[in-house]
Amino acid sequence: GGGGSKHKCVQNSLVNNETLESIMNTLESEEDFRKYFYYLEGSK
């Protein structure tokens, strides 16, 4: 697959037979981090 470059690590991991569940966990934790980062940026 091909998301943006920031998702390359997720995409490359598919070669290693990663499960949908583990990919989802990675994606959701990235989303949580992104929201937290924007929150911190907004509070400056």
């Epitope: 697959g1 091909g2 998301g3 943006g4 998702h7 997720v10 995409q11 598919l14 037979n17 990663e18 499960t19 949908l20 569940e21 990919i23 989802m24 994606l27 959701e28 990235e30 989303e31």
Partner: antibody, heavy 121, light 107 residues
């Protein structure tokens, strides 16, 4: 109750690009824990997964179609889209959009009604 | 890719019969297995997820079992509305793959 509706042209010329949209209502496409996918079914045949996208924009494609497929998401419109380039008669199918997530062990628990796409020469 | 092999491809049965459909995966998929029912002109609908969990609203005559590579869908007493095509799907890893389908026909 989440509902999905596919839209797009029913007829596409050979070698051109097929474009479909799936509109999500009754729930948010930004909900956590879901992939949003496209599946197709040629006349009288079985189901074939085309690809899926996460709300973040990360995409996952069927290797057999990967060079021709693009799936994108527009969370502001509650839509995700399919583009399939260089179509041939073999791409004539009913195209379904669907949701698959943690709640149902990543089975497709919500489907669109399906839209028939015919590739003409 | 994980190959899903479903058998039989079709079965003729009568109302009240017990029907068993099997699905075998080419790799261990734990219990990441889903069964769908599809009627002509309609989208598939989930019957069983997680190999053995019955979807809400699905009659209890449907049951699923198995883990690893071998899975079974059983209809304990076939009803007129059960004549349809059934598909298994592995949801362990991308690319998602489906079995070839089993058409349950009236004998």
């Amino acid at each position: 109750e989440v509902q999905l509706v596919e839209s797009g042209p029913g007829l596409v010329k050979s070698s051109e690009t097929l474009s479909l949209k799936c509109t999500v209502s009754g729930g948010s496409i930004s909900s956590s824990g879901y992939y949003w996918g496209w599946i197709r079914q040629p006349p009288g045949k079985g189901l074939e997964w085309i690809g899926s996208i996460h709300r973040s924009g990360s995409t996952f494609y069927n290797p057999s179609l990967k060079s021709r497929v693009t799936i994108s998401v527009d969370t502001s419109k509650s839509q995700f889209s399919l583009r399939l380039t260089s179509v041939t008669a073999a791409d004539t199918s009913v195209y379904f959009c669907g949701r698959h997530g943690r709640d149902y062990y990543y089975g497709m628990d919500v489907w669109g009604q399906g839209t028939t796409v015919t590739v003409s020469s | 890719d994980i190959q899903m092999t479903q058998s039989p491809s079709s079965v003729s049965a009568s109302v009240g019969d017990r029907v068993t459909i099997t699905c075998r995966s080419s790799q261990d998929i734990n219990n990441w297995l889903v069964w769908y029912q599809q009627k002509p002109g309609k989208a598939p609908k989930v019957l069983i997820y997680g190999a053995s969990r019955l979807q809400s609203g699905v009659p209890s005559r449907f049951s699923g079992s198995g883990s690893g590579t071998d899975f079974t869908l059983t209809i304990s007493s076939l009803q007129p509305e059960d004549f349809a095509t059934y598909y298994c799907q592995q949801a362990n890893s991308f690319p998602l793959t489906f079995g070839g389908g089993t058409k349950v026909e009236i004998k």
